[in-house]
Interface confidence: low
């Protein structure tokens, strides 16, 4: 995954910060649980090496993944996290690449994880350049 | 190590029907979906749709909405394709495959060997 | 329902040969592709996904490229077990569909 830079030059982003909100729940999700949920789905859903996820942030009700990977540690055939956050993009916003449907089915021991805003931050490798999406 | 077991082939009659069994091992089987695909001698490789494990539903392509059904038996970790009323167009190979991660599919990582159904009469 | 042509149905190679398989989409599928490789009386076995990740344990001879609704499938140098029925598949919406199948045979 690449981000166009003002010189045209294109670098591989190396740092994605998606900054999510879930609908209010009866309590906190449990922050092991919801971190061991997301690492599995980056890891099972997207093919993600979970070497590249960084962490897992929570404070009800926003929920911070940072996803990590300089050029050095990415080995052939890895996946990149440019691509895993674009298909996870997709799947919030109900337009999935791969699901039938109901979308994804995200849960925390049984209960359902629903987002309902996201922000996706993209981190290049060449300072200071930083560019910000906006999904609804 | 994961793998998909499918049951033997089938010799049937038209009109008959018949079940087929995809039993699932090696990992959970309630986090992917479970796919059908149809392959006609010579032919090539056709979805027939998909079940979701967590939740038993069934999600059919539209050729094969009527005489077919996804089931499960989850405690056995097993998935089932049954055709009822017999063509000779079912003569085929089924294949179960493994789809994608959560209640939906993907691509197809890990399929079984499949099962030969042939109707005649 | 979106169509997955494969233009060849049979591509003649010789061991040591580069070769490229094309499949074309009906309508843009972004990168949700995937190729599989299927020898006689044998099942289907996943080899790229997402136009161009290597599944696990595939050897890196196997690339696979492209988006929207052109995808390219190539073996850089072709090797004996390589001889089987190649066949694209679309996993951008349901219901899922794949090429027709391109089998690869020595010349």
């Known amino acids: 995954h690449t981000a166009a830079q003002d010189n045209d030059e294109l670098v591989r982003t190396h740092h994605i910060l998606i900054d999510l909100r879930h609908r209010p729940t009866a309590g906190a999700f449990n922050h092991s649980d919801l971190d061991a949920e997301l690492r599995r789905l980056f890891r099972e859903r997207y093919r993600l090496h979970p070497k590249f996820v960084a962490a897992v942030h929570y404070e009800q009700p926003t929920i911070q993944i940072e996803l990590r990977q300089n050029t050095s540690q990415k080995a052939a055939g890895d996946v990149d996290i440019g691509d895993a956050a674009y298909y996870f993009e997709r799947d919030i916003k109900g337009e999935s690449l791969f699901q039938g449907r109901g979308g994804l089915d995200l849960r925390v021991r049984g209960e359902p994880l629903q987002v309902e805003r996201t922000l996706i931050y993209y981190l290049d490798e060449i300072p200071p350049k930083f560019s910000m999406k906006r999904l609804t | 190590q994961i793998q998909l077991v499918q049951s033997g082939p089938e010799l049937k009659k038209p009109g008959e029907t018949v079940k087929i069994s995809c039993k699932a091992s090696g990992y959970t089987f309630t986090n992917y979906g479970m796919n059908w695909v149809k392959q006609a001698p010579g032919k090539g490789l056709k979805w027939m749709g998909w079940?979701?494990?967590?939740?038993?539903?069934?999600t059919y392509a539209e050729e094969f909405k009527g005489r077919f059904a996804f089931s499960l038996e989850t405690s056995a970790s097993t998935a089932y394709l049954q055709i009822n009323n017999l063509k000779k167009e079912d003569t085929a190979t089924y294949f179960c495959g493994r789809g994608g991660y959560g209640s939906s599919y993907w691509y197809f990582d890990v399929w079984g060997a499949g099962t030969t159904v042939t109707v005649s009469s | 329902d979106i169509v997955m042509t494969q233009s060849h149905k049979f591509m003649s190679t010789s061991v040591g040969d580069r070769v490229s398989i094309t499949c074309k989409a009906s309508q843009d599928v972004s990168i949700a592709v995937a190729w599989y490789q299927q020898k006689p009386g044998q099942s289907p076995k996943v080899l790229i996904y997402?136009?161009?990740y290597r599944y696990t344990g595939v050897p890196d001879r196997f690339t696979g490229s492209g988006s929207g609704t052109d995808f390219t499938f190539t073996i850089s140098r072709v090797q004996a077990e390589d001889l089987a029925v190649y066949y694209c598949?679309?996993?951008?919406?349901?219901?899922?569909?794949f090429g027709a199948g391109t089998k690869l045979e020595l010349k």
């Open positions: 079940i979701n494990t967590k939740t038993g539903e069934p």
């Open positions: 598949q679309q996993h951008y919406i349901t219901p899922l569909t």
């Open positions: 997402s136009a161009s």
